[in-house]
Amino acid sequence: AILGRSETQECLFFNANWEKDRTNQTGVEPCYGDKDKRRHCFATWKNISGSIEIVKQGCWLDDINCYDRTDCVEKKDSPEVYFCCCEGNMCNEKFSYFPEMEVTQPTSNPVTPKP
């Protein structure tokens, strides 16, 4: 059973390592894959002394941990590298950090990337 599934056909693309990887730095990435597999968008970033440094954004392969996520939100407490994934076109355009610890109340830190 799959409720309210949103198709992902394209994602915001960004690669901080674009020169070394020989890719574009930024743009829109069409998401390809087997027709029976789901596609997602992702974002990964670092927080260097309070400054957000985007590492990569783009398409992400079928992953059950991305199902039913309409927003790109990292919920892990204090990760080294922040990661989120989501379903829906360009859903990784905005991403946020919303740590959910077991006891304490979460605080939201939305991020709008400006690559």
């Epitope: 941990n65 039913d68 919920k75």
Partner: antibody, heavy 118, light 111 residues
Amino acid sequence: EVQLLESGGGLVQPGGSLRLSCAASGFTFRNSAMSWVRQAPGKGLEWVSGISVTGGSTFYTDSVKGRFTVSRDNSRNTLYLQMNSLRAEDTAVYYCAKVYYYSFFDYWGQGTLVTVSS
Amino acid sequence: QTVVTQEPSFSVSPGGTVTLTCGFNSGSVSTSYWPSWYQQTPGQAPRTLIYNTNTRSSGVPDRFSGSILGNKAALTITGAQADDESDYYCVLWMGSGIWVFGGGTKLTVLG
């Protein structure tokens, strides 16, 4: 420390029902997809069912479709497997497993034994 | 119906190297199936060894490594030790909510 504790196993007659529970702690349950995997006596591991973070998407292996229902209560940090119309071939240890990105099982419970016999 | 195949059994000498493989009947295994590997000793829950083809899980010694060999996923154990004697399972993520386990390989460490 991540802990997954299954319960609800036992002896049941063919055609009967059981509900397994998996109590999760040590991680943010509502942020993890979850799965059930079983192992018949002396046999290999078999994936049974999976569920997305919200519970909005559920999946089953063909042999249990229409008989088993996976669900989750994110407010109680608990995963469930409702098993109806049980058959002898459902006899197994049932493990609950946490699923991480790249869709792999990163933590496992110790399992609960389900025996279907008359 | 997808069937994932593993060698039913394998033997290795202490200190030796062994490579277990994981293939399937519907074509080649690639990294997009996100192969993962699990170790299980009798009476115990499985333990995660490798995910995303070649990433070691936390606490797993670097004697264990994962790769794609030809059209199969592979788990290589170098410098085999007595306590590596276990059952090893590969899992392929088929996508759309479905996983398939291999039948498992029973590894015997000789001596």
